[in-house]
Every structure is written in structure tokens, then in C-alpha cells.
């Protein structure tokens, strides 16, 4: 997942004008994840609810197979919150040894896959060391920013450890985007 | 405060078009909370400054009695940051006992109250275990996402412990919304 | 950096209507900072990439000398994430003395400088005590909110310790704004 370094300028294919109420937008909410084997150090993609409860997609914004698909070129605000939860992390054991243990961590990446570019690009990353001494810990990582996207670009949310994601509440873990 | 699970589809009553400069919007800032008794395990609603300093309400967005009142159906981006502060939390006492203590926690919930639905709905929740070993700790919880709201819906911010909210600065603790 | 306390009402000079695609907007990404001496307790301003990779400025939004310059009066959504990283913080040494050490902290401030007002105003502040017992820690602070800005206002991002900012990835540390 290298970071794209040349993703230049305003999209040229933008339509003349899309009034706000017709702009592509989506708010997706967490659902229980089906176990999918993935490599230890590889980020896992989350899948989302796009229809029940608070979740919706509108105005040609489409959700398919873990991806939000961008229907119209333009500048989008993209956001996500992932709530993580776990039990005591490794380095929480305050040992007497001289060298502290490497901390555990939690990471969220919002990734863009473009037809025009072979490599997925990391748009947003939130990463946090976790070093908790209590028996159970929980905390959110929030991300949000604006990006120039092209029609057909696909967005997904990846996490460092899918088993630590709190999938119990739609208001705790979510993913969304709207054309500005 | 159960979470609504069926809150479907685009509002039908949306006006044909509201140009950006006329769109309902508000940015509210923290003020010192007046002493109000509330039940121990109940989330407390915050009240807000809507006029002084950076705070404002515009274009029929109205603030009344702890609620932001939505004047027009549509899709709104809603956000809040609450900065919490406290003294050493319980589980920070690293005892020699085998079982670590249950962590203290801080929680923020942005809640919607709708005339059409009897139960308040949790739109956004940020919750974090707090297990600090320093004498004083402080940290923010940030939330933001887009929701389809109806005219007359009311939004409020609830917190797990009102006495831990940093009310000293308008730039540390705030709440806002705007029609997209 | 005192907080402005009287910054009232909607700007009067707002143009009749700016369609979305022509609205001023920018997303700036982190770059390696050139060492600049500054006083110990003074917040340091970050400088930003405005052109390479994901970074852009559009529609007369201008970046110059650490500042985003607002080209048109109106209501802007402003956001930033700063990822910090460091080694064990002071108070992580769980000593046997009665008085816990004062925690280290990390702070981000988005500041507005206006021609019409002599003092810089803190729009947004994210501040967090850091008391880590692992050898290396890292964590983001995210901020975002809407403000009424005037043509010519300048925005910058200040941090408590520039040496703790993770400048390695454009998706970890960024700053942006767009006219709503």
C-alpha cells in the first residue's frame, strides 16, 4: 500500500453544476465481519451496512463489495471512525526488565483504488500505540479530510486487526463521503 | 437511549434548492455548566454558547434549551469535540493484585430526538477507557459524520460525566452542524 | 494566543452565490520541517506541502509562508490531523514517590490571524496528556469545525513540539479547509 505522490490538480471531467441535494453521498455503518483469512501484517478491509438504520447511499454513490464507488469526479469529504476494543496489551505488563516492550498498535487506513493507477493509495491514516494496564480498553480513531476523486475511484477502510473492531453499534464505527 | 435501527431513506420534504450561503448551520461553543443534579449512570446533556465569541447559528438553525433544532430536511454534517480532563483515574493505581481494575471511561454521544419517533437515537458515540498514572490527564474525543435529518429534529450532546468536561475554552469543546 | 471573545455574526461581504465547484478549498500535507528556533513554551507553526501528492489549493485559496489565505468571506469547514510520535514520556516512570509527575502533553492549535484584529485567535485546540510506559508511542490528534471567516484571514497550524510531529507520510499529518 504505497502512498501516491503525484495525484495532481482539479478533475477536468466535473459536470457543470450539481446542486447540493443531488450530490453523491453515503454514510455506511459497521456490521459484524465475516472471518476472512489475511496475512499477519496486512491490513484487513472492512465491510459495511449501506441500508439499515442510519446507513444510506444517495445520488449514484454506490457501495459494493467493501468499496464505496465514486460516481462523479470532484472534491469529496471522506470520514471514518473505528472504535477498537481489546484486553490488556502486551506492553501494559510493567516488567522489571530494562528494555520496554514494543507497543501494540491500532491503525485505520482509508484507501483509494483507481482504475488509472495500479497501486492502492493511502488517503488517510490514523495510527496509535496501545499500551494499556487495565483489563479492558476501548478507544476510537477518527479520520476526515477532502480529496479530489475521479469517477470510478473506489474507497475502502482497512484496519490493522479486524478482531479488535467494535462492530456492536452503528454509532461507534462508520464510514462516509460526500461531494463538496 | 437505545439506537434507532430503522431510519430509512432520503427525506421527501426537502425544498427544491437552498444555495450554500442560505443553508442552516451552527457552531456552538462550550460554556460553564450550571449545577444540575442527574442520575449517576445517566448521560448528561451539555448546554452551549450560541452567540458569543466563535459561536453562531444561521439561516433558521436554532439553539434552544440544550438542543440544536433542524429547520429544514436534508443531509447534515454534524460534529463535536469534547475535551475531558481529570485527576488520576482509579485503574491508574497499579496494584500488585493479579486482576487489573475495570477502567474508568469517558463517553460522548450525539443524540437525535425526533417528533416522529419516541426514543432518542444515538447518531454518534465516542467512548474511551481512561487509565492514567499521571496526576492530571486531559484528552479530546472528536466525532463527525453525515445524517439525513427531518425538519424539527433536535440534536444534543451527552457526556458520561459532566464534571470532567473542560469548559474553559471555546476552541477545546464545541458542537456544530451544517446542511450539506 | 488569547482566544477572541467577540467575533460576531455572519460576514456581510459574502458574494451572492458561488457554485460548489468554484468554491475555495485546500488540502495540505505534511513535509519535513526546517528547524526554526522558538521559545520553549511557544507553539511552533508548521509549514505544508500544497502541490505534490494529495495536496492541492483551488479557486483562489492560497498557501503562503505557513498560512492558508482565505480569498472570500463565508463559512468554512477547517480540519487538521497531526500524528505525533515519541519515546517514553517522563511521567511513565512509575516512581514510588507520593506525588505523581506532571504529565507531558501534545497540543495542536488551528489559529486565525485577521487584518482586522491584532491578536491571533485560537479557532480549534486539541490537547492530550501523554504518559506512556512503552519505549515508543505514536498517536494522532484530529480537529475539524466550521467558522465564519473574512476575506484575507490567514490560517495556520501550531503544535506544542515540532520535533514530535510525524512528517513521514502525507496521509498521517494534514491540514485543509473548504467553503461550505
Amino acid at each position: 500500500f504505497p502512498t501516491v505522490t503525484e495525484e495532481r490538480s482539479a478533475p477536468s471531467a466535473q459536470p457543470v453544476y450539481t446542486p447540493s441535494r443531488d450530490k453523491p453521498k453515503a454514510h455506511l455503518t459497521i456490521m459484524r465481519q465475516t472471518p476472512v483469512p489475511h496475512l499477519k501484517n496486512e491490513l484487513a478491509a472492512l465491510h459495511w451496512e449501506n441500508n439499515l438504520g442510519m446507513a444510506f447511499t444517495k445520488n449514484r454513490m454506490n457501495y459494493t463489495n467493501k468499496f464505496l464507488v465514486i460516481p462523479e469526479s470532484g472534491d469529496y469529504f471522506i470520514y471514518s471512525q473505528i472504535t477498537f476494543r481489546g484486553t490488556t496489551s502486551e506492553c501494559g505488563d510493567i516488567s522489571r526488565v530494562r528494555r520496554p516492550k514494543k507497543p501494540d498498535s491500532i491503525t485505520v487506513v482509508i484507501t483509494k483504488v483507481a482504475d488509472s493507477y495500479p497501486e492502492p493509495a493511502h488517503l488517510l491514516t490514523g495510527t496509535k500505540s496501545v499500551c494499556e494496564i487495565s483489563s479492558n480498553w476501548f478507544q476510537p480513531i477518527y479520520l476526515g479530510a477532502m480529496f479530489s476523486l475521479e469517477e470510478g475511484d473506489r474507497l475502502m477502510v482497512n484496519v490493522s486487526d479486524i478482531s479488535l473492531v467494535d462492530y456492536t453499534k452503528e454509532d461507534k464505527t462508520f464510514f462516509g463521503a460526500f461531494l463538496i | 437511549f437505545p439506537t434507532v435501527t430503522e431510519e430509512r431513506s432520503a427525506p421527501s420534504a426537502q425544498p427544491v434548492y437552498t444555495p450554500s450561503r442560505d443553508k442552516p448551520k451552527a457552531h456552538l461553543t462550550i460554556m460553564r455548566q450550571t449545577p444540575v443534579p442527574h442520575l449517576k449512570n445517566e448521560l448528561a446533556a451539555l448546554h452551549w454558547e450560541n452567540n458569543l465569541g466563535m459561536a453562531f447559528t444561521k439561516n433558521r438553525m436554532n439553539y434552544t434549551n440544550k438542543f440544536l433544532v433542524i429547520p429544514e430536511s436534508g443531509d447534515y454534517f454534524i460534529y463535536s469535540q469534547i475535551t475531558f480532563r481529570g485527576t488520576t483515574s482509579e485503574c491508574g493505581d497499579i496494584s500488585r493484585v493479579r486482576r487489573p481494575k475495570k477502567p474508568d471511561s469517558i463517553t460522548v454521544v450525539i443524540t437525535k430526538v425526533a417528533d416522529s419517533y419516541p426514543e432518542p437515537a444515538h447518531l454518534l458515540t465516542g467512548t474511551k477507557s481512561v487509565c492514567e498514572i499521571s496526576s492530571n490527564w486531559f484528552q479530546p474525543i472528536y466525532l463527525g459524520a453525515m445524517f439525513s435529518l427531518e425538519e424539527g429534529d433536535r440534536l444534543m450532546v451527552n457526556v458520561s460525566d459532566i464534571s470532567l468536561v473542560d469548559y474553559t475554552k471555546e476552541d477545546k469543546t464545541f458542537f456544530g452542524a451544517f446542511l450539506i | 494566543f488569547p482566544t477572541v471573545t467577540e467575533e460576531r455574526s455572519a460576514p456581510s461581504a459574502q458574494p451572492v452565490y458561488t457554485p460548489s465547484r468554484d468554491k475555495p478549498k485546500a488540502h495540505l500535507t505534511i513535509m519535513r520541517q526546517t528547524p526554526v528556533p522558538h521559545l520553549k513554551n511557544e507553539l511552533a507553526a508548521l509549514h505544508w506541502e500544497n502541490n505534490l501528492g494529495m495536496a492541492f489549493t483551488k479557486n483562489r485559496m492560497n498557501y503562503t509562508n505557513k498560512f492558508l489565505v482565505i480569498p472570500e468571506s463565508g463559512d468554512y469547514f477547517i480540519y487538521s490531523q497531526i500524528t505525533f510520535r515519541g519515546t517514553t514520556s517522563e511521567c511513565g516512570d512509575i516512581s514510588r514517590v507520593r506525588r505523581p509527575k506532571k504529565p507531558d502533553s501534545i497540543t495542536v492549535v488551528i489559529t486565525k490571524v485577521a487584518d482586522s484584529y491584532p491578536e491571533p485567535a485560537h479557532l480549534l485546540t486539541g490537547t492530550k496528556s501523554v504518559c506512556e510506559i512503552s519505549s515508543n508511542w505514536f498517536q494522532p490528534i484530529y480537529l475539524g469545525a466550521m467558522f465564519s471567516l473574512e476575506e484575507g484571514d490567514r490560517l495556520m497550524v501550531n503544535v506544542s513540539d515540532i520535533s514530535l510531529v510525524d512528517y513521514t507520510k502525507e496521509d498521517k499529518t494534514f491540514f485543509g479547509a473548504f467553503l461550505i
Epitope: - | 460554556m31 460553564r32 455548566q33 450550571t34 449545577p35 444540575v36 443534579p37 442527574h38 449517576k40 454558547e49 458569543l52 480532563r85 481529570g86 485527576t87 496526576s135 492530571n136 460525566d161 459532566i162 464534571s163 470532567l164 468536561v165 474553559t168 | 471573545t5 506525588r99 505523581p100
Partner: antibody, heavy 119, light 110 residues
Amino acid sequence: QVQLVQSGAEVKKPGASVKVSCKASGYTFTSYDINWVRQAPGQGLEWMGWLNPNSGYTGYAQKFQGRVTMTADRSTSTAYMELSSLRSEDTAVYYCAREVPETAAFEYWGQGTLVTVSS
Amino acid sequence: QSVLTQPPSVSGAPGQRVTISCTSSSSDIGAGLGVHWYQQLPGTAPKLLIEGYYNRPSGVPDRFSGSKSGTSASLTITGLLPEDEGDYYCQSWDGTLSALFGGGTKLTVL
């Protein structure tokens, strides 16, 4: 230096009202909340409420709700505390105190104003 | 209604060390802002001695120190002096954001 200077002693009849003033100097009056605390003769300290001089907002102790009014005059950097429907048990020394924003401790105190309620 | 409880009186000889405790009836006392200590010498207004459990404002001698354990806070005075004689109050904020004072402790220097 920071100073809070209070008005002089008052004698009032039961049922009357009293208005105590607290003039601040040596700092920006609107930047710090003012609290009022009273002390009955030979008794401990009792908190009455706070006032934000910038906004005029107040927060009162449950016990005094409906009977106390705290106000500020920004032009003279003066805070006021008015207590109505006085009774004999309101006889006390009334103090104003400036608060530390970060910890809400009472850092600077006025010299106190004795209010005697007697028929 | 939350309560802060202090011993009514303590005493010590000059040069000695005394500790005044302040116990809360509720776990949320001081959670956000800590416990503060005030000294009131006879006929004068109270003076802030310790803020946020531990911190001494400038001008307060280091003979005064504060600590915390569970739902209790303590003020310790070492090297007692005759001029320390007076009343000492702990203060905090409860979960409803009301300020609370302890009943006060009279310190007598023997």
C-alpha cells in the same frame, strides 16, 4: 497585583435584600470567573455560586436558587451578589473569590463583607 | 448530597508534622478538578494553599504538601510553626458541578 475589594458591612432586616460588591483590579476582569462564598459566625465555608463576568452567565448552589442574583458591571470591573428574602441565618461574612480556570480553585479572595440580619 | 469530611481539630508541637485528611462520601468528588486546600488565619480571608491535590501556588512554603489516596485527600504540614495556627478547609467540585467545602479543621500549635 490582583486585588478584590469588597463593599462595607451591612445591617438588614429580615425579608429585605442585600447587594454586596466586589471590585477587581490588577487583571482582565472578563477573563476569570468570580465565585461567592459565605461564612456564618464560628462556622465553615459555604459556596453560593459563580459568575462569568464576560457573558454574565451564572451557576448557583441549589440552596440559594431563586434567592441569589450575581451580576457584573464590566465598565467598572465590579461583581455583585444580591441575596433577597433575608433571614437571621443569612448573617455571615460574604467573600468574593477569583477562580483558577484550569482547576477551579479559589486563588484570590476579597477581604469579606459582614452582613448582619436582625430585627 | 455529597460531603467532604475533615477531622474537627488536630494539634502538634512546633517543628512537628501534622496531617489533615479530607474524605469524600462519593467517588466522583475531585474526579475532574482535584481537591484544593485553604488556610484561614484568625480574622482573615481564606488563602489557597494547595490546588489539584498536589500543587502549591507561588509563595506557599514547601512545608505544605498535598496528596491523594482513593477517595481521600490529605494536607501535610511539616516543621510546624506557631503562625500556622488557624482553620484549614478542603474543597472540591461534585458531579453536579457544585463546589463543596469540608467542615474545616482547627490546627492548634502546642
